[in-house]
């Protein structure tokens, strides 16, 4: 798959119409076969994957993806230069960091090259589609005899752009205690029981200062603190997803 640049008319949305007549829209039939929806996620602001369900096509079809930004010097659609494949059929596009502009409307066009009228144009706010990496380097330290501090790190994304969800529980707890921590990668637990063993984990999302992503990262690797005696009920301590 080669990268191409398509000239775009002033209104790419008109170009995507099937019929350009004065017929009232209620008499216009949509394409017999709708194109699959494109779903994009920006992974840690390092790369973006835009994917579609290629198996929804009744015949194996290599759909093409073109994209541009609403406000850009070069107001042309650019073809994906790195397609993702599922069973040898295009099912997505990976876009590299240098092509990601979080705060401009992302315009993405999916097209059937064998039926050029079969195309769909979607618009996306990329700042709401960021999924951070899981927090790393979780470290625990004693602030006092009974007070613990948990710290962690996030790679490549400014801390002020992230919101964190911290979960912890002891070996005596059936469920996690959780709380939201905004922008500061630290959390202190004022009272811990040294006879219990605690487990902590953290995940993050790009919200609410720099974007409004609802997607949480994966959970960090858990860290433990406290008594290393055998739990009374080890099954309670198993980490659920």
């Amino acid at each position: 798959w080669s990268s191409k640049v398509l000239m775009s008319s002033a209104n790419e949305d008109i170009k995507a119409d099937l019929i350009l007549t004065s017929t009232a829209p209620e008499h216009l039939s949509a394409p017999t076969l709708p194109l699959p929806e494109v779903q994009c996620f920006v992974f840690n602001i390092e790369y973006m994957n835009c994917t579609w369900n290629s198996s929804s096509e009744p015949q194996a079809t290599n759909l093409t993806l073109h994209y541009r930004y609403k406000v850009s010097d070069n107001n042309t659609f650019q073809e994906c230069s790195h397609y993702l494949f599922s069973k040898e059929i295009t099912s997505g596009c990976q876009i590299q960091k240098e092509d990601i502009q979080l705060y401009q409307t992302f315009v993405v066009q999916l097209q059937d090259p064998q039926k050029p009228q079969r195309r769909a144009v979607q618009k996306l706010n990329l700042q709401n589609l960021v999924i951070p990496r899981a927090p790393e380097n979780l470290t625990l330290s004693n602030l006092s005899e009974s007070q613990l501090e948990l710290r962690w790190k996030s790679r490549h994304i400014k801390e002020r752009c992230l919101q964190y969800l911290v979960q912890y529980r002891s070996n005596r707890d059936r469920s996690w205690t959780e709380l939201i921590v905004n922008h500061e990668p630290r959390f202190s637990l004022p009272s811990v029981d040294e006879l219990k063993r605690y487990t902590f984990r953290v995940r993050s999302r790009y919200n609410p200062i720099c974007g409004s992503s609802q997607q949480w990262s994966k959970w960090s690797q858990p860290v433990h603190w406290g008594s290393h005696t055998v739990e009374e009920n080890p099954s309670l301590f198993a980490l659920e997803a």
Epitope: A16, P25, K123, N125
Partner: nanobody, 126 residues
Framework: QVQLQESGGGLVQAGGSLRLSCAAS????????MGWFRQAPGKEREFVAC???????FYADSVEGRFTFSRDNAKNATYLQMNSLQPEDTAVYYC????????????????????WGQGTQVTVSL
């Protein structure tokens, strides 16, 4: 299947405002991407505004800052508030919908929409 019905069109002087409504019946709009399009006599149908059911809203350059798209899922309706209207805004305005799987899907291509209203005439005079 959803049915859509626009209302609120009319004759207005340049600089004036109108609020178009698009009422849906038959099914909830809560998982529909919605759009507004317009067609002036002898011209191609043109994208005006669209949204996703997740809350993202987008506008054509020609109306950005003047028009506001909103939806009220409780009333099963969408609205297009049009301010600072100009003669070039004169057209039949159509509301359109498409069921979508993803909260972020917003279509600006008219052939992506499966349900259309009958349209409402907006005329802006000098």
């Amino acid at each position: 299947q959803v049915q859509l019905q626009e209302s609120g069109g009319g004759l207005v002087q340049a600089g004036g405002s109108l609020r178009l409504s698009c009422a849906a019946s038959g099914r909830t709009l809560s998982r529909y991407a919605m759009g507004w399009f317009r067609q002036a006599p002898g011209k191609e149908r043109e994208f005006v505004a669209c949204d996703s059911w997740g809350g993202d809203t987008f506008y054509a350059d020609s109306v950005e800052g003047r028009f506001t798209f909103s939806r009220d899922n409780a009333k099963n309706a969408t609205y297009l508030q049009m301010n600072s209207l100009q003669p070039e805004d004169t057209a039949v305005y159509y509301c359109a919908g498409a069921p979508t799987s993803f909260a972020t899907t917003a279509y600006s291509s008219s052939n992506s929409y499966t349900v259309w209203g009958q349209g409402t005439q907006v005329t802006v005079s000098l």
